[in-house]
Amino acid sequence: APVPPGEDSKDVAAPHRQPLTSSERIDKQIRYILDGISALRKETCNKSNMCESSKEALAENNLNLPKMAEKDGCFQSGFNEETCLVKIITGLLEFEVYLEYLQNRFESSEEQARAVQMSTKVLIQFLQKKAKNLDAITTPDPTTNASLLTKLQAQNQWLQDMTTHLILRSFKEFLQSSLRALRQM
């Protein structure tokens, strides 16, 4: 697993550095998760040919994965810091069930999958501290999540491979869009 944020070689080499600001900590946390996703995608792509499938072919799925849209306030056109922050937190909370699904999907990267899940929880906490309007954040219903998880786990092998690939790809894209928006705040 990659070294957790705040413990990379640069930090060791520069102990005199200023403590990280809240924004820097969030930035580093997202980059750490992206590293984890990259490692998981490597294993997925080595195991199946899903990574070669076109976006159009993969779009034919019934997963309701969070995605950034212009109305969410994270794009430069219509940028709104608070609306965007709410979207990022809500989206990450919605991804949690899918990250739970990933937990038994990896052989050599089991630890990495756990690290991505745990780091995402930490990221959510960081972002919640930054948000002013916590009331606007809707938490997914645990019962709905439980039945979704059961349904995903009951799929055949091919569909499970497809689902794994789609989750990783969509999560990466969501984090990249979030990273870009957060750096404008």
Epitope: T21, K55, F75, Q76, R183, Q184
Partner: antibody, heavy 122, light 107 residues
Framework: QVTLKESGPGILKPSQTLSLTCSFS??????????VGWIRQPSGKGLEWLAH???????YYNPSLKSQLTISKDTSRNQVFLKITSVDTADTATYYC??????????????WGQGTSVTVSS | DIVMTQSPATLSVTPGDRVSLSCRAS??????LHWYQQKSHESPRLLIK???QSISGIPSRFSGSGSGSDFTLSINSVEPEDVGVYYC?????????FGAGTKLELK
Amino acid sequence: QVTLKESGPGILKPSQTLSLTCSFSGFSLSTSGMGVGWIRQPSGKGLEWLAHIWWDDDKYYNPSLKSQLTISKDTSRNQVFLKITSVDTADTATYYCARSYDDYLYYALDYWGQGTSVTVSS
Amino acid sequence: DIVMTQSPATLSVTPGDRVSLSCRASQSISDYLHWYQQKSHESPRLLIKSVSQSISGIPSRFSGSGSGSDFTLSINSVEPEDVGVYYCQNGHSFPLTFGAGTKLELK
């Protein structure tokens, strides 16, 4: 292998609209983390970033020129476009398009086109 | 906007010299700092990414250091072909901004 090539009108008159095209190969603008930007450089001067467009169609503009700029893309044809309205002689420059791509969105411009020279003159 | 300030404006060197080019950001940009080289009548090319990451095809004599708002590009033994203008770039947030450049010339 990644290549980018700019094309434009060469010469135009003040108050006209400048239309530039960046045609690229070796990558797809539908890949997450991928972006293409426009940068210009008046002769003998420094680099000025103008606009950037991303895989998800998010667009960023230089605030000092925002009202004049429009960036767009045709992902299937591997092209990015920039329009600058109401040009002036100060817009005379070499215009470059460049790619940015990495997981962390570092906004580093790793491949550049050869540039297209634009002269605004009455 | 983040303002990037480069110094010196011009640097006259002798082949074999070790040189340092400075770049300062008006606010902290963490490690989102990149260096470009532009030779006469050519497009800029990425030299160093993210403060110190080397780029494929770029000679190892080029290296970068710094963090936060103060950055340095070093050339450990200048070659005649290194003549040109060197730009640093803020890659932290939009608008992307470049320094005015440091012109490297031979004495």
